[in-house]
Amino acid sequence: QESLSCDASGVCDGRSRSFTSIPSGLTAAMKSLDLSFNKITYIGHGDLRACANLQVLILKSSRINTIEGDAFYSLGSLEHLDLSDNHLSSLSSSWFGPLSSLKYLNLMGNPYQTLGVTSLFPNLTNLQTLRIGNVETFSEIRRIDFAGLTSLNELEIKALSLRNYQSQSLKSIRDIHHLTLHLSESAFLLEIFADILSSVRYLELRDTNLARFQFSPLPVDEVSSPMKKLAFRGSVLTDESFNELLKLLRYILELSEVEFDDCTLNGLGDFNPSESDVVSELGKVETVTIRRLHIPQFYLFYDLSTVYSLLEKVKRITVENSKVFLVPCSFSQHLKSLEFLDLSENLMVEEYLKNSACKGAWPSLQTLVLSQNHLRSMQKTGEILLTLKNLTSLDISRNTFHPMPDSCQWPEKMRFLNLSSTGIRVVKTCIPQTLEVLDVSNNNLDSFSLFLPRLQELYISRNKLKTLPDASLFPVLLVMKIRENAVSTFSKDQLGSFPKLETLEAGDNHFVCSCELLSFTMETPALAQILVDWPDSYLCDSPPRLHGHRLQDARPSVLECHQ
């Protein structure tokens, strides 16, 4: 059996050491003890007695099935306790009585059915994070379960086999910053929602099949809900249940952000938000994020005209990796307040983009992200987007473009352009001179000779440049990142010719550690202020005797350098 390894500050690591019991020889000097991934099975009343100053105890995945009632009695300083993924089929309030300093408690992934016969947490007045529940056996949430807890930063409840929720069980916690609920179905959702309405600021619902969700008015008085964000992850919806979910919004008037992540819509987008008051009550929602939305019949999907009015005030929309091939012109025109639109990892092509960015589309749009779509022509893309009079930032990275032409048209206010990972070999005057930020990293560029008078930031890492670009091309450049190219040297003159350069990242290049380069780096201690990744990323490639040495440490041969 291996032993613990402890550092000078009292942090002890005993992970995966094949311990079959709590190791002996624990002392009051220990501040943190991690015994995860062992086969401990049992914690006796004297096992941790000596650890009076312990602040962190991690016992996850250690096959613990029994803990004596007074096993933690000496741990009054403990702030972090992780008992997750063990074999505890019942929980005892006597474990937690002495733990008055506890801030973090993880009991998730143990095979208990309830949280115990009496309240577990009445003494945990400092608790900030609580994780409870499991996938298969945790079946009942009762009113006594959260007694004594008044305020939590994070509460995560995995209740994927919930059979009973006692009304008002969660109501006793007056303030919860972030509540994550893993529920397999919507049976108790309305009851829970009513109980958390006045306490939760961010509600995250995971793995819930909402296909049969039906709204009914909540038994609550006029309530001012603090909820700002609502997220659905791994949920299943239908057109009908989406309409029903919308009706919940009348209770959360301060909601500003809605997120759907890895959800399935078994429908066609035939939404019909019947209640006109829903429209006005969506007024504060500014951010809608949809990632990996799976629509089995996406090819039959509706034009969403029924929800146009719902989204008129939204400022930020992300629809990522969801097979989007068209935003209908009329929809784009209704998105009057939209400032940020991210359509990354979709199926957009120029022909449909032209319809999406029609005259009057997205009139307030400032940032458009079309990364990893199916765009081919930079010239066409720029031309199509001329309708976007307020566009300042465009990301068309990770599209495979044809070689760029000599001239292109772009929205006149455009200041930021991301062309990273687009396979470009040559930059031409197609790139607009108005740019302040240009990202051409991860391409096949072996030179860069384009005059960009306003450029402040150039990102050109992971290319094939052999030298730093000429400083006269960028008279106001502040930042250049040119890592992982084939740059062999830089000199005082080169760096000095960038009058405003504040940040240069040029590590992981093929530096030839010549007398000139090494004497320059030795004579210029101020390099550390401008080279953000100095010194660890600056290694000699040649000569062979210095290969792999840091430039900072490499010493030129007196013989070579004083000939």
């Epitope: 298969e136 994927l160 086999s161 099949n209 089995p296």
Partner: nanobody, 122 residues
């Protein structure tokens, strides 16, 4: 209606590995949550693992977590259970199940395979 057929069971040494497969018929495989359960002789059927429709969420029984991995290939209508560091206590008949709900509660699964036996010898 979806039909499920498990394969890949057999005899393994303690500390060894097996990969179970569950092939589903029909074109609606990706609409189902898939679970693995097991039943040892003289014991009740118990939850092993679950995976959601996209494969983006997975969960495990505490008794197998860190040793078993569930994954699915929706293009091939198949869900897999990769079992490593096998122990004699893992000896059981392993069943694959399909349902609408992401849960470890076996009563919520509508479709079941016939099972594939796994024996782990010490």
């Amino acid at each position: 209606e979806v039909q499920l057929v498990e394969s890949g069971g057999g005899l393994a040494q303690a500390g060894g590995s097996l990969r179970l497969s569950c092939a589903a018929s029909g074109r609606t495989f990706s609409r189902y949550v898939m679970g693995w359960f097991r039943q040892a002789p003289g014991k009740e059927r118990e939850f092993v693992s679950v995976i959601n429709r996209s494969g983006g969420s997975t969960d495990y029984s505490t008794y197998v977590k860190g040793r078993f991995t569930i994954f699915r290939d929706n293009a091939k209508n198949t869900v897999f259970l990769e079992m490593t560091s096998l122990e004699p206590e893992d000896t059981a008949v392993y069943y694959c199940a399909a349902g609408e709900y992401y849960t470890g509660d076996s009563s919520r699964y509508d479709h079941w395979g016939q099972g594939t036996p796994v024996t782990v010898s010490s």
